[in-house]
Amino acid sequence: IVGGTNSSWGEWPWQVSLQVKLTAQRHLCGGSLIGHQWVLTAAHCFDGLPLQDVWRIYSGILNLSDITKDTPFSQIKEIIIHQNYKVSEGNHDIALIKLQAPLNYTEFQKPICLPSKGDTSTIYTNCWVTGWGFSKEKGEIQNILQKVNIPLVTNEECQKAYADAKIAQAMVCAGYKEGGKDACKGDSGGPLVCKHNGMWRLVGITSWGEGCARREQPGVYTKVAEYMDWILEKTQSSDGKAQMQSPA
């Protein structure tokens, strides 16, 4: 996160760290807890690393440097990448992770509410992006979970900023015209959440951007509302019943 500040314990209890353990262990992506056994993240996090057993998912964590060999983590039972995601295209950058064992909810580890299907009418004015990603383009993973308040921008505005790309309906963009605040490398897959009527909802999944926090280059996020049917279908067919945290 560029231009952000330290988060507090329990402030973003749905935020998880997706880490890969090969020879060493490192944080690669963020994710959002959306049910006892489900994490929503970006499909591109698994490019070249589709093997379930190399991944470790840490929830209820604020400081990555607190993680030791004794810190409990979740393992992956199943990775469900959106069927239309292609490595050569930025579209449909969404994936579900089914955990091997359900997580208990605590003050520091609980799910984020999902938006209503095809939610286009809600005007979100209080949106935040969180993650342990770089604090500048040529930076490094941060220890303490960072947060930054960023306004949504229209898809028309976003398309103007990215004339050489296709900003699809299933994407949402956020950023300041002057830059300075944005997600960055290592924040991918993490949440863009907005508070509306006193409730936090998962509006976007950190996907891509041109560099980080550049002027007139907003961050691009996967628009979760456009994938509600897919999320429900995949979680129900796997579970027999939905265990999602939907808005009341």
Epitope: A42, H44, D47, K86, V87, S88, E89, G90, N91, D93, G133, Q159, A163, D164, A165, K166, A168, A183, C184, K185, G186, D187, S188, T206, S207, W208, G209, E210, G211, C212
Partner: antibody, heavy 125, light 108 residues
Amino acid sequence: EVQLLESGGGLVQPGGSLRLSCAASGFTFSHYLMTWVRQAPGKGLEWVSYISPSGGHTIYADSVKGRFTISRDNSKNTLYLQMNSLRAEDTAVYYCAMVGQGIRGRSRTSYFAQWGQGTLVTVSS
Amino acid sequence: EIVLTQSPGTLSLSPGERATLSCRTSQFVNSNYLAWYQQKPGQAPRLLIYGASSRATGIPDRFSGSGSGTDFTLTISRLEPEDFAVYYCQQSSRTPWTFGQGTKVEIK
């Protein structure tokens, strides 16, 4: 399966015009940036031009600027290259290519993911 | 414009040997925008590596890419008969997009 099929090449006199076409299939054409690359006989590859998915944004190499025009018809899944004021040095095999723009570490990648078989343009009197 | 310089111009090796091809850029290139292509006589180029180090779909793991900044490398760990071809590096970090002049890998 992604397929790109160029056509329209041939022999043309210096100062003449030619319009190349590239018919695309097997992918969502309107989502992809498209490009033309050429290769003079026995030489290396030279990028010519690209066009954004919507067709609203185009960029050209200095060597063809003002003479060549790239365009696309997303309803026909076809890419075009209108070549005017042709010169002997424009003689080459012209390839159209689909530009992959994936995501890696929250940044985009960009590369020529699929290529057509090429069409030969010969400019000679 | 960003100039890409490939070396050597020609590499004469035997099947089974290791090939190391270099690509130097005149300015910094974000590695996400550096690709390698293979071209055989009479054929269109084929994508091998994108993002400096990611193998394209269907490319055997004997091909690997590495490097960052201004210095990039394509390595073929054990040359197979079908690997003898011309290899190009290419950047799309900044327009005009540019290619290296190519390295020909020929049978010794």
